[in-house]
Interface confidence: low
Amino acid sequence: QPPPPPPDATCHQVRSFFQRLQPGLKWVPETPVPGSDLQVCLPKGPTCCSRKMEEKYQLTARLNMEQLLQSASMELKFLIIQNAAVFQEAFEIVVRHAKNYTNAMFKNNYPSLTPQAFEFVGEFFTDVSLYILGSDINVDDMVNELFDSLFPVIYTQLMNPGLPDSALDINECLRGARRDLKVFGNFPKLIMTQVSKSLQVTRIFLQALNLGIEVINTTDHLKFSKDCGRMLTRMWYCSYCQGLMMVKPCGGYCNVVMQGCMAGVVEIDKYWREYILSLEELVNGMYRIYDMENVLLGLFSTIHDSIQYVQKNAGKLTTTIGKLCAHSQQRQYRSAYYPEDLFIDKKVLKVAHVEHEETLSSRRRELIQKLKSFISFYSALPGYICSHSPVAENDTLCWNGQELVERYSQKAARNGMKNQFNLHELKMKGPEPVVSQIIDKLKHINQLLRTMSVPKGRVLDKNLDEEGFESGDCGDDEDECIGGSGDGMMKVKNQLRFLAELAYDLDVDDVPGNNQQATPKDNEISTFHNLGNVH
């Protein structure tokens, strides 16, 4: 073991370095002192450090550690924040356009139903938005309310436009008849299934992304313990006390210290891995009736079909309702208004699905691929931080926390540390309360994600389109009745492209909380200017 180089007889170098950390030199001894009051950088001989300097080093070391951690998670944090913002906005846009298409359908095909239909459609889609954002609304109730509200208007405006004013107090009876007589066939049930499945998945997807942000934010702002601060000080700063300004910590030593400091954080690893894999499973199942974009943008068509269904059976219904709601001056004749462009244009439908494949679903898959590259983020953190802080290559001629050594030996280092600090004790303390809380939240979301994932091999609930549809209202090859008549489909395709572009039009500056985001390069610089890294 080589003897240490002669100490700086005047503490001059230490003074000039410490000046950068703490302007004012009253804490730095002029010449080396015994240092009997030191608690972290225990001297083997005269030292250029004082107790006050040691305290400042500990503070700086913990600050550096926090910066390193934030720099390590910056890319991942930005990825999730950006995507959570993109998807939330995209889902809002989908809802808005779904509302537009539905209103356009009413306006173009059933002008006599507006403006009441606009009002009911508006309320329905407002509820859809609130549900996606986490409101406690029942999807079946939303759909029932839409059809309960629509039927009286359809009856009085389309089926019986000649009803005298005195007979218009039958709305409540008509609302009841709507369900009892299944006037819309199985379309309300079909919409309930499509909307509830697609919105549940959408909602949990957004919740999961937001929890991802919370996980990163939690670990990003961890306050490191005093014990950890001492270990970091010993690794990064105690060499200066001996006048060893150019020496770097041993890589192996850095790993031991980081594993000690981050023992609690690393416990997240198992649940983080499961989170990403569960999210991937959910995303893989987000298509057709599990894809809100597909479902909501096709709703106008399904609602259109449901009104057609009423019209096909209008004669029979008018008679039955006439008796059921027993209003005196009933004039039974059907509306003469029958739009011609009411049937599904299969060519347009197929094109719409091709377009759809290039939009939000591909963006989701792309997010999962990027997230998977961070699957080992937490287990790799100690190594990442050491590789992004100054350490000696190949563990040769480096600082082991006590002295300059030619080669780092973990065993020797451990023996030398016995009186100073027990690494094992630090590991045994268990995670911080905030880390335990975030682990519990991850466990919960993982359970939800697993519950919501579409079981393998089950693509669609085929029984849905075989129950009670008359005269081929919903054919087997029509994608669960999602899709649409020629009405408005061109608009659907344009908007799907627009949604695909939305994600990529976001600048870094547009992402909340990232206005001052430094590049990794900048972050390394800001992290290490404190370390006085002149190596």
């Epitope: 993109v86 906005e89 209103n103 356009a104 306006k107 061109m490 627009f498 039009d505 976001l506 547009d510």
Partner: antibody, heavy 120, light 107 residues
Framework: EVQLVESGGGLVQPGGSLRLSCAAS????????MNWVRQAPGKGLEWVSY????????YYADSVKGRFTISRDNAQNSLYLQMNSLRDEDTAVYYC?????????????WGQGTMVTVSS | DIQLTQSPSFLSASVGDRVTITCRAS??????LAWYQQEPGKAPKLLIY???TLQSGVPSRFSGSGSGTEFTLTITSLQPEDFATYYC?????????FGQGTKVEIK
């Protein structure tokens, strides 16, 4: 009373910069998308830029892309247009306009406009 | 980009006349079209959106129709305050574009 008031126009040399502001009042500014539209002297209307209520979605006309930046401060009920590398053809009256909240897009409220003259 | 072509560019008419302005789109814009009126020295004012929906406060003599690529603005009985320039605007896809304008003058 629902109102939009633009300010910040003036004379500027080619290559120079200018920042336009639009103060909104009488409605919940944070709930509406906003636009900038311009009109060169004696010419028609040209849409310049749009920002969504949250500023997360932003669009520009090709003629200003890379030179103009739209932004908003919902706390201050203000919309901005930062115009850099100005050219002669940017001379126009600049209007801010509100995006309607209804089912269909349309610019339902307009400011009175502010004149920007780019000339050496 | 979607081009909008208005015709005519200039129109002379008298008070009480029925006036029709046409707006043609270079591609299908469904019903995503708005009409604006602009008096000299003033800001534009929204008249009609979604092809035919009258903006609140706009007199019922104004009406809009059409879909796809061909749209019309009709003023049934021209009033003195209606002499102005009229613009159509498509809001189907970005960039949002305006027609070149139709100036309605007193005959």
């Amino acid at each position: 009373e629902v109102q939009l008031v633009e300010s910040g126009g003036g004379l500027v040399q080619p290559g120079g910069s200018l920042r336009l502001s639009c103060a909104a009042s009488g409605f919940t500014f944070s709930g509406f998308g906003m636009n900038w539209v311009r009109q060169a002297p004696g010419k028609g209307l040209e849409w310049v830029s749009y920002t969504s209520s949250s500023s997360r979605t932003i669009y520009y006309a090709d003629s200003v892309k890379g030179r103009f930046t739209i932004s908003r401060d919902n706390a201050q009920n203000s919309l901005y247009l930062q115009m850099n590398s100005l050219r002669d053809e940017d001379t126009a009256v600049y209007y801010c306009a509100r995006d309607s909240s209804g089912w269909y897009d349309a610019f339902d409220i307009w400011g009175q406009g502010t004149m920007v003259t780019v000339s050496s | 980009d979607i081009q909008l072509t208005q015709s005519p560019s200039f129109l002379s008419a008298s008070v009480g006349d029925r006036v029709t302005i046409t707006c043609r789109a270079s591609q299908d814009i469904s019903s995503y079209l708005a009409w604006y009126q602009q008096e000299p020295g003033k800001a534009p004012k929204l008249l009609i959106y979604a092809t035919s929906t009258l903006q609140s406060g706009v007199p019922s003599r104004f009406s809009g129709s059409g879909s796809g690529t061909e749209f019309t603005l009709t003023i049934t009985s021209l009033q003195p305050e209606d002499f102005a320039t009229y613009y159509c605007q498509q809001l189907n896809s970005y960039p949002w574009t305006f027609g070149q304008g139709t100036k309605v003058e007193i005959k």
